[in-house]
Each structure stands twice: as structure tokens, then as C-alpha cells.
């Protein structure tokens, strides 16, 4: 990139520029014409016969350097060929001499600084590539000449130009003073500002683009040349900050469209909202999620949003006693999340109908909540107990819902305490043929004992067939039809409104061998 | 501004020669292009011929060849035009003009003439 | 030499008409063609260099086009003031300066 600090070419009014010295043949200005036809202003000297020696001087006016530390002079200029020139001296030349001054300010005057090699600083000495001649009975026929001349290194705030001719017939048709500068670049989201540099090479610090992020590593810089040119070199660069993708080329970060997002910064493109997510505005990170579905506060932020699951469905319960087996079938919407567990809820209702939550007594196995598998086994059910059950279905954002949870309820009613086990049997009296037993009357807790049932079989014949029931309704029984001297063994349950209790333990007992030891009491 | 100030009005026999001067007043002369038109009474114009002083030698139209010498002073600013075997169909006004770029001064080698003398009568009569 | 013919040999016209006058070279001159005004007992005055290049201080209503063999030039609107006679002229690199026999304007 190339910073004009003169352009003749754009001057419209006079240049009045400073000559030296003031006498006839000296540089002179005129009105020219460029090859756009345009109207240019120029300078022109043409003293070929002049004494050797002498100098005629044009000096620009005062250039501020504006920073630059090297500037470079295009020269366009027109020469005559000395052969062409009948009455043209030896002191004819073909070439002029360019150099600066530098200062501070615009001090220069008409004698100052002295017209001179030091302290003017000679630039170089300018020969002409093309030189316009003329021979007799044809026209003159020349070509402009085009010569670029770098000034430099420059401290002070500006300078002046100058040239000197000895002896040349040219004119100087356009000086176009510029220095060179590394234009404003953007590359990889990184913007380098635009540079003019002070050496070969001058290293620029970038800094990222709106709505980028500098990436891991060093930060990113990018070589100014002298030439204005910037340096091939990679660049670590910035990458978009969430929310924002590159665009135009890696030159700038768009904000993610309504209905996109992008989570993290760095390279990658913003992606449509995952499922049951929005987001109603541009540049997002994160989609909102709709009303009802949730993310917990696991899942990464381009997750899909989900929702709690349904209800389990169809509880089978199976009472044993004090145990019961709960099973269920998973819920028909798992939310669309794999972090299916299961909980449950109790409360029981005793017989004269309060209720409250189940008490501590009861367990759970495997537990009552945080289950995996669709069943439990609770133990410790008391009897005459109703238990409700509710079966819930949790997932990873149950917990942030609101509302009701939804539930599988399931009623179970234990039957009411029966009697306990007729223990301590013992045998009144012993015959040959009969038994005549007693035992303790059992405590029955719901209710009292409406009867007894007592079972006996011979030792030995352990068959179904072999196996004999009575019922009384007292706590004692006579067994009769027994065979003589055989071993009998005797268990009772007691009966009350619940129903019977557990057998008790087998009682062993034997009739007598013959009718004469007659009736014999046996006491426990 | 360049001013061109031609010589008076000339009388001459036919068969004679007449020479008109024209001088420029003021900055570069010597690469300016100065030519010579004519222009006879109730006529259009006629260019006759041009010269750069700084290269000597003038160009002439194929008509005015060998009768007519067009030379130039850079010391005193000052070209001539010597016109020779006058005839009677001479007469004429005879203006010098100065083209508008010098030799080094335009892209193109345009010979545009922005300056003219006032004009000499020359009167060719026996 | 290259001849130079310019059409009408004159014309009448009115103030505020558009005005065209032609130059025909009898061979290619690309576009080295000058375009002078001269009013009578004046010298000739350079309106148009270059074919189309209106010279300093012309009107702009004054305007020149053409290229190689055929030229115009046109007054867009014609002021009192204008009425003269017109010249084209030739230049090339082979020495002379052709006029054409020109063009008088007259008020209609």
C-alpha cells in the first residue's frame, strides 16, 4: 500500500517551486500534457551552452514525512538527445542529479540551506533511458522516462527535494513522493493493523476481530516489510467466541442465525438447535430449552433437552405374608434420556383407618429408590395393614421440574394376624387305641381362637393318605381308633376371624400296649 | 502570458522575397514548436511549415518546399519566416503561432497552436 | 499531404441551436485533429486539441469527437457570440498541418 505525500499530477494551481540560481535558462514551469491528457504542471530547463560548472537548482517545497522512515520518489521526465541539438555545447548532458534536505520545519529560503552536496544528501545521479531526438526532415520522437528513487532512513519532520542540472534539455513532468505501508489485513479472525515500517521487517501484534477469541498459544503477529508488503508467515490467529462462526473468508465472526448455536469457541460452524431447544435470538451458545424439557446440569450444552419420564405402568404386587414382591413395566416416554431410575413412595392405613407414611420398619430390597430394574421386595409388612404404593419413574432432569411427578399407585392389604403355633402339646391320657392330648391356648392378636385343628399320623407312614385331621373347639382332643403300642406324631393350629395360624411343632406320643396298664395320664 | 509580436506589413514586388519576424516575450522559446499559417483575402488558413529552435532545422508542407526558409534566434526569442519567388496569389496575412506544449512538455507531439501573432500583411503587386 | 475536407462550407443557424460541423482525413490521423475558431480581421483561436481535449478557458458547450478518418465537433447551444468560422486542422508525424477549407456560421 502506498501513502502519497506529493503528487504533481493532482496540483492544479501553480507549484512555485524554489530555482537557484535566478538567471536566465533556469528551470522553469509549465503547463504539460500526461498521457490521459490531462493538464499537468511541469518543470523545464534547457540550457545546453552554459559555462561548465554551473548548476541550475529546483527545489520542491517543504514534504512532512508523516512517519515515514523511507520514501520513495517516482520521477516521469523527458530529455533531449544531445546529438539532436545543433548548436548544443559540450557541457550538454544526459542526465540531472536528485537529492533531499531534511528539517524540522519548512525553514528553507531562497539561499538556505546552501545550494550544495552537504548538506544536501545526494540521492543518485538519474540517466535517461529514452531520449527524445529529431533528425533532419522527420519528426521528434521520445518516450517519457520513469525512474524511482528511495529516500531514507528520514528522522526529522520533513524534507525537501532537489534537482540539480548541469547541462540537460528535460523536463520534469510528474514527482510522485510516497512511502510504502502494510495495508490493515485480516486473516484467520485476526486483525493487523495497518504498519509503516521503520525497518526491513517490523513485527505488528494482531488483535482478534469483533466477537473472537485469541486461540491457545502465543499471541498472534504477523512482519511488516520494508516494502510494504506483509510476510508470509502463519498465524496462530483468534478463533469465534461462542455463539458466532467465521465468515467472509475467516475475516469476521457472524452471530449463529435464529434457531442456531454454537457452544464453544474456536473453528466449527453453528449447528441447528438439538431437539426440543430454541433460540429466538441471534448469536447463541446455548438453545433455550422448550417449556416442560430441561438439561441437567451434566449434559453438555448442545444436548438435546428432555423431559421427566411418564409414569410406570401395570404394577403386579405379590403379598407373602409379611413380604411383598412389587414389579412394574417401564414408562411409555422415557423423556428421551437413559437414566431411567425408579422410586417409591408408602404410606399405610391401619385397621381403624389413620394413615400416615410407612414407618421405618419396612425395607426395601434392593431400595426405595435410585432402582434400576423394575421391581422391589418389601419385607416387614405389618398385618391388617393397607399399604399404598406409589411408583414413580425418575430420569437426570426430574428434578428440575416443577409440578406433580407421575406415579403408578398400587393398594395392597396384608391379611390380619392368624393365631400363632400351637406349641407345649401334652398327652392327658393313653390307651391302646386312643390319645387324649392338651396344650396352652394360644394369644391370638386379632381376635379370639374359634377352633383347633389338630393333624396326626403314625409314625412311619408318612403318606397323604396316612394323614388325619380333627377339629375342636376346645384346647384338648381325643384321639381315637389308634393302633396298639404304635408311635403317633401329633401338631394343632388354632384358628381365629384371620384365619388359621401355622402348624405347631410335631409332638410325639404313644398308645399303650394293652387294655390292662389301662388308662394311663401323661403329663407333660 | 507568452506574447508573439510580428513584424509590420510588408509591400513586395513579384519575384522578390519578403521575411517576417515574430518575437515571443517572455520564458522558453527554444523547445515551443512555432509555426507559420497564411492566409489569403476571403481564404482559409494555410500552414506553411514549423521549427523547433532548440533542433535548428524546420519541416515545411510539400506546397511551400524549396520557396520558403523558416529559422529561429534562441538568443533573442525571435523566429523568421523568409518566403521567395513572391507571386501575386502571396498575398496574404502571415501569422506566426506557438504550440501549446513544448517538445518535452506533452505525452503526444501535438501541434496545437494556443498563441498567434497579430498577423503581417504581405502585398505582392508590380 | 494528407487532405483535409470539412462539411457544410457554411451554415445558418439560430441562438440556443445544437450545431455540427464534420472533418474527413484523407487518411488515418488517429486522433491528432485541432479544431480553431476565427472571427473576421482576428487570429485564428485553439478551441479543441487532441480530437475530443477542450483547450483552457473554452465553453463547455464546445465539444470535439472522432478517431482515425472521421471527426465532429459540436456546439451544444449556439450563442451569439459564436458565430465565426470554423476550422479543423490535422497534425501528424509526417510533418505537416493540413487545414480544412472551413466552416462559416452565419445567424439564420
Known amino acids: 500500500l502506498e501513502e502519497t505525500l506529493l503528487n504533481t499530477k493532482l496540483e492544479t494551481a501553480d507549484l512555485k517551486w524554489v530555482t537557484f540560481p535566478q538567471v536566465d535558462g533556469q528551470w522553469e514551469e509549465l503547463s504539460g500534457l500526461d498521457e490521459e491528457q490531462h493538464s499537468v504542471r511541469t518543470y523545464e530547463v534547457c540550457d545546453v551552452q552554459r559555462a561548465p560548472g554551473q548548476a541550475h537548482w529546483l527545489r520542491t517545497g517543504w514534504v512532512p514525512r508523516r512517519g515515514a522512515v523511507h520514501v520513495y520518489a517516482t520521477l516521469r521526465f523527458t530529455m533531449l538527445e544531445c546529438l539532436s541539438l545543433p548548436r548544443a555545447g559540450r557541457s550538454c548532458k544526459e542526465t540531472f542529479t536528485v537529492f533531499y534536505y531534511e528539517s524540522d520545519a519548512d525553514t528553507a529560503t531562497a539561499l538556505t540551506p546552501a545550494w550544495m552536496e552537504n548538506p544536501y544528501i545526494k540521492v543518485d545521479t538519474v540517466a535517461a533511458e529514452h531520449l527524445t531526438r529529431k533528425r533532419p526532415g522527420a519528426e521528434a520522437t521520445g518516450k517519457v522516462n520513469v525512474k524511482t528513487l528511495r529516500l531514507g532512513p528520514l528522522s526529522k519532520a520533513g524534507f525537501y527535494l532537489a534537482f540539480q542540472d548541469q547541462g540537460a534539455c528535460m523536463a520534469l513532468l510528474s514527482l510522485h513522493l510516497f512511502y510504502k505501508k502494510c495495508a490493515q489485513l485480516t486473516v484467520n479472525l485476526t486483525r493487523f493493523p495497518e504498519t509503516v515500517p521503520r525497518e526491513l521487517v517490523v513485527p505488528v501484534a494482531g488483535s482478534c476481530v469483533v466477537d473472537a477469541v485469541p486461540a491457545p498459544g502465543p499471541s498472534p503477529s504477523l512482519y511488516c516489510r520494508e516494502d510494504g508488503q506483509w510476510a508470509e508467515q502463519p498465524v496462530t490467529g483468534c478463533s469465534c467466541a461462542p455463539g458466532f462462526e467465521a465468515a467472509e473468508g475467516n475475516t469476521k465472526c457472524r452471530a449463529c442465525a435464529q434457531g442456531t448455536f454454537k457452544p464453544l469457541s474456536g473453528e466449527g460452524s453453528c449447528q441447528p438447535c438439538p431437539a426440543n431447544s430454541h433460540s429466538n435470538t441471534i448469536g447463541s451458545a446455548v438453545c433455550q430449552c422448550r417449556v416442560g424439557y430441561f438439561r441437567a446440569r451434566t449434559d453438555p450444552r448442545g444436548a438435546p433437552c428432555t423431559t421427566p419420564p411418564s409414569a410406570p405402568r401395570s404394577v403386579v404386587s405379590r403379598l407373602n405374608g409379611s413380604s411383598l414382591h412389587l414389579e412394574w413395566s417401564a414408562p411409555l416416554e422415557s423423556g428421551g434420556r437413559e437414566d431411567l431410575t425408579y422410586a417409591l413412595r408408602c404410606r399405610e392405613c391401619r385397621p381403624g383407618g389413620s394413615c400416615a407414611p410407612c414407618g421405618g420398619d419396612l425395607t426395601f430390597d434392593p431400595g426405595p429408590r435410585d432402582l434400576v430394574e423394575p421391581w422391589v421386595v418389601v419385607r416387614g409388612l405389618r398385618p391388617d395393614f393397607t399399604y399404598t404404593f406409589e411408583v414413580t419413574a425418575l430420569n437426570g432432569v426430574s428434578s428440575l421440574a416443577t409440578g406433580p411427578v407421575p406415579f403408578e399407585p398400587v393398594n395392597v392389604t396384608t391379611d390380619r394376624e392368624v393365631p400363632p403355633a400351637v406349641s407345649d402339646i401334652r398327652v392327658t391320657r393313653s390307651s391302646p387305641s386312643s390319645l387324649s392330648l392338651a396344650w396352652a391356648v394360644p394369644r391370638a392378636p386379632s381376635g379370639a381362637v374359634l377352633d383347633y385343628e389338630v393333624k396326626y399320623h403314625e409314625k412311619g407312614a408318612e403318606g397323604p393318605s396316612s394323614v388325619r385331621f380333627l377339629k375342636t373347639s376346645e384346647n384338648r382332643a381325643e384321639l381315637r381308633g389308634l393302633k396298639r403300642g404304635a408311635s403317633y406324631l401329633v401338631q394343632v393350629r388354632a384358628r381365629s376371624e384371620a384365619g388359621y395360624g401355622p402348624f405347631g411343632q410335631e409332638h410325639h406320643s404313644q398308645t399303650q400296649l394293652d387294655e390292662s396298664e389301662g388308662w394311663r395320664e401323661q403329663l407333660a | 502570458q507568452v506574447q508573439l509580436v510580428q513584424s509590420g506589413a510588408e509591400v513586395k514586388k513579384p519575384g522578390s522575397s519578403v521575411k517576417v519576424s515574430c518575437k515571443a516575450s517572455?520564458?522558453?522559446?527554444?523547445?515551443?514548436?512555432i509555426s507559420w499559417v497564411r492566409q489569403a483575402p476571403g481564404q482559409g488558413l494555410e500552414w506553411m511549415g514549423k521549427?523547433?529552435?532548440?533542433?535548428?532545422?524546420?519541416d515545411y508542407a510539400q506546397k511551400f518546399q524549396g520557396r520558403v526558409t523558416i529559422t529561429a534566434d534562441e538568443s533573442t526569442s525571435t523566429a523568421y519566416m523568409e518566403l521567395s519567388s513572391l507571386r501575386s496569389e502571396d498575398t496574404a496575412v502571415y501569422y506566426c503561432?506557438?504550440?501549446?506544449?513544448?517538445?518535452?512538455?506533452?505525452?503526444?507531439?501535438?501541434?496545437?497552436?494556443?498563441?498567434w501573432g497579430q498577423g503581417t500583411l504581405v502585398t505582392v503587386s508590380s | 499531404d494528407i487532405q483535409m475536407t470539412q462539411s457544410p462550407s457554411s451554415l445558418s443557424a439560430s441562438v440556443g441551436d445544437r450545431v455540427t460541423i464534420t472533418c474527413r482525413a484523407s487518411?488515418?490521423?488517429?486522433?491528432?485533429l485541432n479544431w480553431y475558431q476565427q472571427k473576421p480581421g482576428k487570429a485564428p483561436k485553439l478551441l479543441i486539441y487532441?480530437?475530443?481535449i477542450l483547450q483552457s478557458g473554452v465553453p463547455s458547450r464546445f465539444s470535439g469527437s472522432g478517431s482515425g478518418t472521421d471527426f465532429t465537433l459540436t456546439i451544444s447551444s449556439l450563442q451569439p457570440e459564436d458565430f465565426a468560422t470554423y476550422y479543423c486542422?490535422?497534425?501528424?508525424?509526417?510533418?505537416?498541418?493540413?487545414f480544412g477549407q472551413g466552416t462559416k456560421v452565419e445567424i439564420k
Open positions: 517572455g520564458g522558453t522559446f527554444s523547445t515551443y514548436a
Open positions: 503561432a506557438r504550440s501549446s506544449y513544448t517538445i518535452l512538455t506533452t505525452y503526444y507531439n501535438y501541434n496545437a497552436m494556443d498563441n
Open positions: 486542422q490535422q497534425y501528424d508525424f509526417y510533418l505537416s498541418g493540413t
Open positions: 521549427i523547433i529552435p532548440i533542433f535548428g532545422d524546420a
Open positions: 487532441g480530437s475530443s
Open positions: 487518411q488515418n490521423i488517429n486522433n491528432f
